[in-house]
Amino acid sequence: EDELQVIQPEKSVSVAAGESATLRCAMTSLIPVGPIMWFRGAGAGRELIYNQKEGHFPRVTTVSELTKRNNLDFSISISNITPADAGTYYCVKFRKGSPDDVEFKSGAGTELSVRAKPS
């Protein structure tokens, strides 16, 4: 069985302020089991944008229905983009662990740039 890969097809995405940004991410396998998370930035200071397991992320919607048991699409849409949202977004697969899940594999990242709102 091939090892899971995390595919973020776009290196960069440009969105006008006030619009929604779609950040695409797909897995090549459902195994190992464990949640998907999205982060802005990398390293210790990265910001959690979305956690499949839990939490309230009012500006984030998932493009696919994550409750499908065979779902491999973990793309997200972030609404009402502002310049403060600019940065590189990483789709990260975790494998289950106890007490904490373990980071398994990250996508290559998608850089979000924000254009000025058209006048």
């Epitope: 459902l30 089991v33 839990e54 994550l66 409750t67 499908k68 048991r69 106890s98």
Partner: antibody, heavy 118, light 107 residues
Framework: DVQLVESGGGVVRPGESLRLSCAAS????????MSWVRQAPGKGLEWLAG????????YYIDSVKGRFTISRDNSKNSLYLQMNSLTAEDTAVYYC???????????WGLGTLVTVSS | ALTQPASVSANPGETVKITCSGG??????YGWYQQKSPGSAPVTVI????KRPSDIPSRFSGSASGSAATLTITGVRVEDEAVYFC???????????FGAGTTLTVL
């Protein structure tokens, strides 16, 4: 509080059909996958079927595939199980259950009893 | 198939461990379900291997390693007498399965 209330159970003859319902309240029903689980008298739990939050994807154990159909109406906060060609082996208490993000169960209904007897 | 002992017994205050084997660690999540009488509604005491719902006492804990999961009740009480079913979700097959149940008797 999360509440799941099953209804529609009863006594039927072999070969007949029955439709079970599960009324959900206390949570955003349309955001959760749901399942049906049954327990035959003196036996353990048996998962039967699951359905995604939007209702587009369904999953079944082999023994009920083709006979049972799981469905939902998110506008009515309701889950259903259509059971056809019933046999004595389908006699059980039927529970609806809310799924967690990883398809285990966190809340269960009180159950409804289905008896198949001639 | 998930395998668990048919019965366990303990005195009040003791620690009880119930094991459940049969799943592959990398494709399986486990849960534990308490049923106090046949035909009564099950109660989830553990899901996602080790996650305890907020209304479940802290004496219940869960773990998983290798091909097995364990439910631990630390300081068991008389009201914990019940049948405990382990359950699993397999990400390879998309199927849920249950063990046959373990009857816990508190002496």
């Amino acid at each position: 509080d999360v509440q799941l209330v099953e209804s529609g159970g009863g006594v039927v003859r072999p070969g007949e059909s029955l439709r079970l319902s599960c009324a959900a309240s206390g949570f955003t029903f349309s955001s959760y996958a749901m399942s049906w689980v049954r327990q035959a008298p003196g036996k353990g739990l048996e998962w039967l079927a699951g359905i995604s939050a939007g209702g587009s994807d369904t999953y079944y154990i082999d023994s009920v595939k083709g006979r049972f159909t799981i469905s939902r109406d998110n506008s009515k906060n309701s889950l259903y199980l259509q059971m056809n060609s019933l046999t004595a082996e389908d006699t059980a208490v039927y529970y609806c259950a809310r799924e967690t993000w990883n398809h285990l169960f966190d809340y269960w209904g009180l159950g409804t009893l289905v008896t198949v007897s001639s | 198939a998930l395998t668990q002992p048919a019965s366990v017994s303990a005195n009040p205050g003791e620690t009880v461990k119930i094991t459940c084997s049969g799943g592959d660690y990398y494709s399986t999540y486990y849960g534990w379900y308490q049923q106090k009488s046949p035909g009564s509604a099950p109660v989830t005491v553990i899901h996602s291997d080790d996650k305890r719902p907020s209304d479940i006492p802290s004496r219940f804990s869960g773990s998983a390693s290798g091909s097995a999961a364990t439910l631990t009740i630390t300081g068991v009480r008389v009201e914990d007498e019940a049948v405990y079913f382990c359950g699993a979700y397999d990400g390879r097959t998309y199927i849920n399965t249950f063990g046959a149940g373990t009857t816990l008797t508190v002496l």
